[in-house]
């Protein structure tokens, strides 16, 4: 994991200050209000998945 100010997070992930690590943009459909999702705006939005039965 990268710290802020060093190498950027790998492709498809974004830095989370809340969690202090790079996080996967793929988790943003389920957790859209996560701080790191702002850094995932360039990725095409995935439709919301059926997490609630």
């Amino acid at each position: 994991e990268q710290a802020p100010g060093t190498a950027p997070c790998s492709r498809g992930s974004s830095w989370s200050a809340d969690l202090d690590k790079c996080m996967d943009c793929a988790s943003c459909p389920a957790r859209p209000h996560s701080d790191f999702c702002l850094g995932c705006a360039a990725a095409p939005p995935a439709p919301f998945r059926l997490l609630w039965p």
């Epitope: 996967d24 793929a26 389920a30 990725a43 095409p44 998945r49 997490l51 039965p53």
Partner: antibody, heavy 119, light 111 residues
């Protein structure tokens, strides 16, 4: 270092109750959904229950086999998650693991606690 | 519920060779952007450990000899070259919807 410690397992008779506990450390507990997953030779790995965050009003979800019998809860002040199991059946015999997930991946697993339901 | 079918149930691979494990889902677990499929390793007597997330992304600290691929309903875990420490059972798991389900596991033995 992430640590997850399950406890509370043991031998219980059919129809009985048991409460499992899991104490977590090494990650921001309040930001992670928490799961219970069980493993038996007969059914393999089987997701049991999930509890989300305070901001989600601690929403809970259950596998069909757990609905109406099991209750998942969490205490953020103690970084702990619990599984209250009632009306236990022989098919509930398994090793029970707690595991945090941010959204999709069960990032860490404890050592598990063994539950045996038998007369 | 989404059913995950793994094959083979077990395999024996010579040290240094390639191990290939398949996981087929009963419905698609992918969008145009992401695949919601994970792989876990469980060594004998141990708890499961996350290896690969979102079909192809290695978890932190996982050696590069592990790789995942696939989308839709067909996914593959490859290990090359296999090492002694890879003796374990491997499970796929989807996070497309609730309930989360796991494959039945593939036991890998190193010859």
């Amino acid at each position: 270092e992430v640590k997850l410690g399950e406890s509370g397992g043991g031998l219980v008779q059919p129809g009985g109750s048991m409460k499992l506990s899991c104490v977590a450390s090494g990650f921001p507990f309040t930001k992670y959904w928490m799961n219970w997953v069980r493993q038996s030779p007969e059914k393999g790995l089987e997701w049991v229950a999930e509890i989300r965050l305070k901001s989600d009003n601690y929403a809970t979800h259950y596998a069909e086999s757990a609905k109406g019998r099991f209750t998942i809860s969490r205490d953020d002040s103690r970084s702990s998650v619990y599984l209250q199991m009632n009306n236990l059946r022989a098919e509930d015999t398994a090793i029970y693991y707690c595991s945090p997930t941010y959204a999709d991946t069960m990032d860490y697993w404890g050592q598990g606690t063994s539950v045996t339901v038998s007369s | 519920d989404i059913v995950l079918t793994q094959s083979p149930a077990s395999l024996a691979v010579s040290l240094g060779q390639r191990a290939t494990i398949s996981c087929k889902a009963s419905q698609s677990v992918s969008t145009s952007t992401y695949s919601y499929m994970q792989w876990y390793q469980q060594r004998p007597g141990q708890s499961p450990k996350l290896l690969i997330k979102y079909a192809s992304k290695l978890d932190s600290g996982v050696p590069a000899r592990f790789s995942g691929s696939g989308s839709g309903t067909d996914f593959t875990l490859n290990i090359h070259p296999v090492e002694e420490e890879d003796t374990a059972t491997y499970y796929c798991q989807h996070s497309w919807e609730l309930p989360y389900t796991f494959g039945g596991g593939t036991r890998l033995e190193i010859k």
